[in-house]
């Protein structure tokens, strides 16, 4: 299954990145799981995961990073609390767990760069 | 003449950002010409541009917004004063002036991401 | 030394024709690596622009203005590009210049192409009369 995903993205100076993760449904889904997955340094980290119904809200765990909202076959995430470190891909997975049958599919990742902010001048 | 340049820099949240631009010099040039171009929006633009004796530092005109060292065929370009409206691929343009033959290298750019940086809250 | 001299320019009336030659000495076009050669031309008080290009495998490309009036071609044998120009109109005069780049072709779409462009000859001179 095919899932898209913009190539680049800048995190804003607050440490907040926001991209979609477009996927090519084969079948009528009403349960989707999206996982947001982080490749750096050869490594490949889990940054978040949510499932949904269809229609429904994303719904992150309450101590996740990232939020997330839904329409059709796109997912809005949002990743936040970024610093300079934490640049590198973030790849997409979706998974359509119900009904059968199970469909699979990993976008080729976004990179997001994170600039960590100067810090402001003491107010004396 | 091969000319290479890093893929991406990121500019510091203060606006400035560094890369290297190295060329492969066919000959023993004495006098060698410099020009950062900026590509965006299907247009060329130039940045700046510095003549320099091997051995001896870049002089960029007063106003211009780069300086730069030099240390055998390599130019250390520094780029400041930058905002998110200049991002953009700026391709390095290397040309030996002198002694003959003259030679041409153009590298295939360096995508500069700049984020304008948010303001600092008021100190009353 | 690696030298361009364009020739061919001159006067003539509306709806006439010039054929521009840019000969190279100091290297042949298939063992140097211009990618790309082109025609550029700069009227008095404006940026040079590019006319027409082509790339090492042939391929060419043109500047809307010239197109259906103007072709370009090269003969790799004598290291000659060619600038064959018909129907020219009052707005083509200026000075043209042949030059060289290490890129392909793809560039000379971009607005201040030139600017990725080196071994500028000295120009020929073209002025079309009403």
């Known amino acids: 299954m095919h899932v898209a995903q913009p190539a680049v993205v800048l995190a804003s100076s607050r440490g907040i990145a926001s991209f979609v993760c477009e996927y090519a449904s084969p079948g009528k889904a009403t349960e989707v799981r999206v996982t947001v997955l982080r490749q750096a340094d050869s490594q490949v980290t889990e940054v978040c995961a949510a499932t949904y119904m269809m229609g429904n809200e994303l719904t992150f765990l309450d101590d996740s990073i990232c939020t997330g909202t839904s329409s059709g076959n796109q997912v809005n995430l949002t990743i936040q609390g970024l610093r300079a470190m934490d640049t590198g891909l973030y790849i997409c997975k979706v998974e359509l767990m119900y009904p059968p049958p199970y469909y699979l599919g990993i976008g080729n990742g976004t990179q997001i760069y994170v600039i960590d902010p100067e810090p402001c001048p003491d107010s004396d | 003449m091969h000319v290479a340049q890093p893929a991406v820099v990121l500019a510091s949240s203060r606006g400035i950002a560094s890369f290297v631009c190295e060329y492969a010099s066919p000959g023993k040039a004495t006098e060698v010409r410099v020009t950062v171009l900026r590509q965006a929006d299907s247009q060329v633009t130039e940045v700046c541009a510095a003549t320099y004796m091997m051995g001896n530092e870049l002089t960029f005109l007063d106003d211009s917004i780069c300086t730069g060292t030099s240390s055998g065929n390599q130019v250390n370009l520094t780029i400041q004063g930058l905002r998110a409206m200049d991002t953009g691929l700026y391709i390095c343009k290397v040309e030996l002036m002198y002694p003959p033959p003259y030679y041409l290298g153009i590298g295939n750019g360096t995508q500069i991401y700049v984020i304008d940086p948010e303001p600092c809250p008021d100190s009353d | 030394q690696v030298q361009l001299q364009e020739s061919g320019g001159g006067s003539v009336q509306a709806g006439g024709s010039l054929r521009l030659s840019c000969a190279a000495s100091?290297?042949?076009?298939?063992?140097?690596?211009?990618?790309?050669m082109g025609w550029f031309r700069q009227a008095p008080g404006k940026e040079r622009e590019g006319v027409a290009a082509?790339?090492?495998?042939?391929?060419?490309s043109y500047a809307d203005s010239v197109k259906g009036r103007f072709t370009i071609s090269k003969d790799n044998a004598k290291n000659t590009l060619y600038l064959q120009m018909n129907s020219l109109k009052p707005e083509d005069t200026a000075m043209y210049y042949c030059a060289a780049s290490p890129r392909t072709c793809e560039v000379f779409s971009l607005g201040g192409s030139w600017h990725l462009f080196g071994y500028w000859g000295q120009g020929t001179q073209v002025t079309v009369s009403s």
């Open positions: 100091g290297y042949t076009y298939s063992s140097y690596n211009s990618n790309c």
């Open positions: 082509i790339d090492s495998d042939g391929s060419t």
